[in-house]
Amino acid sequence: KFSKQSWGLENEALIVRCPRQGKPSYTVDWYYSQTNKSIPTQERNRVFASGQLLKFLPAAVADSGIYTCIVRSPTFNRTGYANVTIYKKQSDCNVPDYLMYSTVSGSEKNSKIYCPTIDLYNWTAPLEWFKNCQALQGSRYRAHKSFLVIDNVMTEDAGDYTCKFIHNENGANYSVTATRSFTVKDEQGFSLFPVIGAPAQNEIKEVEIGKNANLTCSACFGKGTQFLAAVLWQLNGTKITDFGEPRIQQEEGQNQSFSNGLACLDMVLRIADVKEEDLLLQYDCLALNLHGLRRHTVRLSRKNPIDHHS
C-alpha cells in the first residue's frame, strides 16, 4: 500500500512523491534504504529531498534502488517506500514495456491522452507529443494543457504516445519523457444539447437558517463517453471560487453516472451554516458541452422549523 514503483530514463529529471498521506507542514525525511543514508535537502545536490518529493536532477542508472520516506507528524512517524528504477536510453525507437505507463482508451467522441506524472513537475506549455518516435503534426492533433486531443479518432490512431516536456528547477532545465499506450474503442455514442434533470427551472429550495444545505446540479449530455462536458454552480453570475464565501463550496470533482446509457454529471453545492443573506443570492446550475450552455436558476427560501412541544 505504501510502496510505489517509479521509473525514469538516465539524464532526464525524475520526481517521486512519498506514498504516505500527510500535511504540507509535516517534516519528511528521505533515506536510501540499502545504506540507510540520509538524502540531502540542499538543492545543489543532483539527488535531493524537497518535502514529500524526491528529485533526481538528472537521474543516473546508479540511482536505482529503494528509497524510504518517513513522514513525521506531531503524533506519529509513518514510513513509505519508493522503488526507483532508472533505465539507459534506448538507441532504437521501441519503448519497452517496463517504461510504459497505464494504457488509456478513447473513442471517436473522446480522445484525451494525459501525460503521466506531469503534475509533479514544474513545466510550462506546450507539451511535445510523439507517436512511434514521430512528432505529431497536423490539425487533428492538439496539445492542450497536460493532455493531447486527437480529432476524429480512427483505429489507426492506436499506438504508443510519448509526451516530452521541460522541468525547470532554479533556472536549470531538465528534459522528461513519458510513454503510454492508446487504444481505440468503437463506440456508438452521441452528444446532445445538455439536459438539466435537477434542479427544476426557477426552483425554490427550502432551507433552515443555521443548518447545512446541499443543492445538486445534474445534467445529461448524450450517450457514451462525452468530450468537454461539465456542470457547475454560479452565485449571482460568479464562479464559486471567485465569489469568496468559504461556507459555500462546490464538491470536489464531478460524479459521472450513466443512467439508461446516458452520460450524466452532477455537482453538489454545499452551504454550511445557512445565513439570512444566502436567501438573497441567485444560484445558477450550469451545464455545458460543445453544443452550448443551459442554465437553471434556484433560489432559497426560509423553512420554518416545526415547533416541538415537550
Epitope: 500500500k1 505504501f2 498521506q21 500527510g22 500535511k23 507542514s25 509535516y26 513522514v71 507528524s73 506531531p74 503524533t75 506519529f76 509513518r78 514510513t79 468559504p246
Partner: antibody, heavy 117, light 106 residues
Framework: EVQLQQSVAELVRPGASVKLSCTAS????????MHWVKQRPEQGLEWIGR????????EYAPKFQDKATMTADTSSNTAYLQLSSLTSEDTAVYYC??????????WGQGTSVTVSS | ETTVTQSPASLSVATGEKVTIRCITN??????IHWYQQKPGEPPKLLIS???TLRPGVPSRFSSSGYGTDFVFTIENTLSEDVADYYC????????FGAGTKLELK
C-alpha cells in the same frame, strides 16, 4: 502535555441539533488532524470522520455523512462536531481525538449526549 | 469499504496467562492496523500503531503481528490491570474499528 477538553454532557430533544466542542491545550490543532469517534452505551467504537483544521478539509464515514458536520476554529484551537436531526440512536459518548491521517493518539474525555424528550 | 471482523467478543483468563485477539479484514491492508485499550469510564488508549509498533510507555508484554488480512494482538503474562476492552482499527481505507473484545479475569 497535550490535553483535549470536552464538555461533560448534553441533553437534547429528538429532532434537534447539538454542537460539541473540543479545545486543545499544549498543541496547535492546525498541525495535525482531529478525529471524532462515537461510542453508544455498552457498545464499540465508531469512527465518524476527520478534519484537517488548517484548511477545513473533512472526510466522513459513509454512515455519518448526513448526520455529522465537523468544523474547526484555529484561532481558539477548537474543533466542533455538529449532529443534526437527533434520535435515540444518537445517544452516545462522542470523543474527539488528535492524530495524523491514519490514527488517533490523544483523546478527549468524551461528551455524553442524551437524546430524550 | 474495508470491514473488520474481531474475535472473540469476550474472554476470561487467569493472571499470568496469555491472551490472543484476532482481527480479519475483507481487503488486503498490508500492516495498517492499530490496537487500542479502553478501560471502563476512560477514553481509548493507543497501545500499538501500524507496523506492529509499540507506542512509547506501553509495556512489552503487549505485541501484535500480521500482514495483509489477518492480524493478531497478544498479551503475555496478563495482569489484573489489563482488564479492559480491546479494539483493532484499520486505516487503509477510511477508518474502521473492530467490534471489540472484552477481557476479564477468572
Amino acid at each position: 502535555e497535550v490535553q483535549l477538553q470536552q464538555s461533560v454532557a448534553e441533553l437534547v430533544r429528538p429532532g434537534a441539533s447539538v454542537k460539541l466542542s473540543c479545545t486543545a491545550s499544549a498543541f496547535n490543532i492546525k498541525d495535525d488532524y482531529m478525529h471524532w469517534v462515537k461510542q453508544r452505551p455498552e457498545q464499540g467504537l465508531e469512527w465518524i470522520g476527520r478534519i484537517d483544521p488548517a484548511i477545513g478539509n473533512t472526510e466522513y464515514a459513509p454512515k455519518f455523512q448526513d448526520k455529522a458536520t465537523m468544523t474547526a476554529d484555529t484561532s481558539s484551537n477548537t474543533a466542533y462536531l455538529q449532529l443534526s436531526s437527533l434520535t435515540s440512536e444518537d445517544t452516545a459518548v462522542y470523543y474527539c481525538a488528535l492524530g495524523d491521517f491514519y490514527a488517533m493518539d490523544y483523546w478527549g474525555q468524551g461528551t455524553s449526549v442524551t437524546v430524550s424528550s | 469499504e474495508t470491514t473488520v471482523t474481531q474475535s472473540p467478543a469476550s474472554l476470561s483468563v487467569a493472571t499470568g496467562e496469555k491472551v490472543t485477539i484476532r482481527c480479519i479484514t475483507n481487503t488486503d491492508i498490508d500492516d495498517v492496523i492499530h490496537w487500542y485499550q479502553q478501560k471502563p469510564g476512560e477514553p481509548p488508549k493507543l497501545l500499538i500503531s501500524e507496523g506492529n509498533t509499540l507506542r512509547p510507555g506501553v509495556p512489552s508484554r503487549f505485541s501484535s503481528s500480521g500482514y495483509g488480512t489477518d492480524f493478531v494482538f497478544t498479551i503475555e503474562n496478563t495482569l489484573s490491570e489489563d482488564v479492559a476492552d480491546y479494539y483493532c482499527l484499520q486505516s487503509d481505507n477510511m477508518l474502521t474499528f473492530g467490534a471489540g473484545t472484552k477481557l476479564e479475569l477468572k
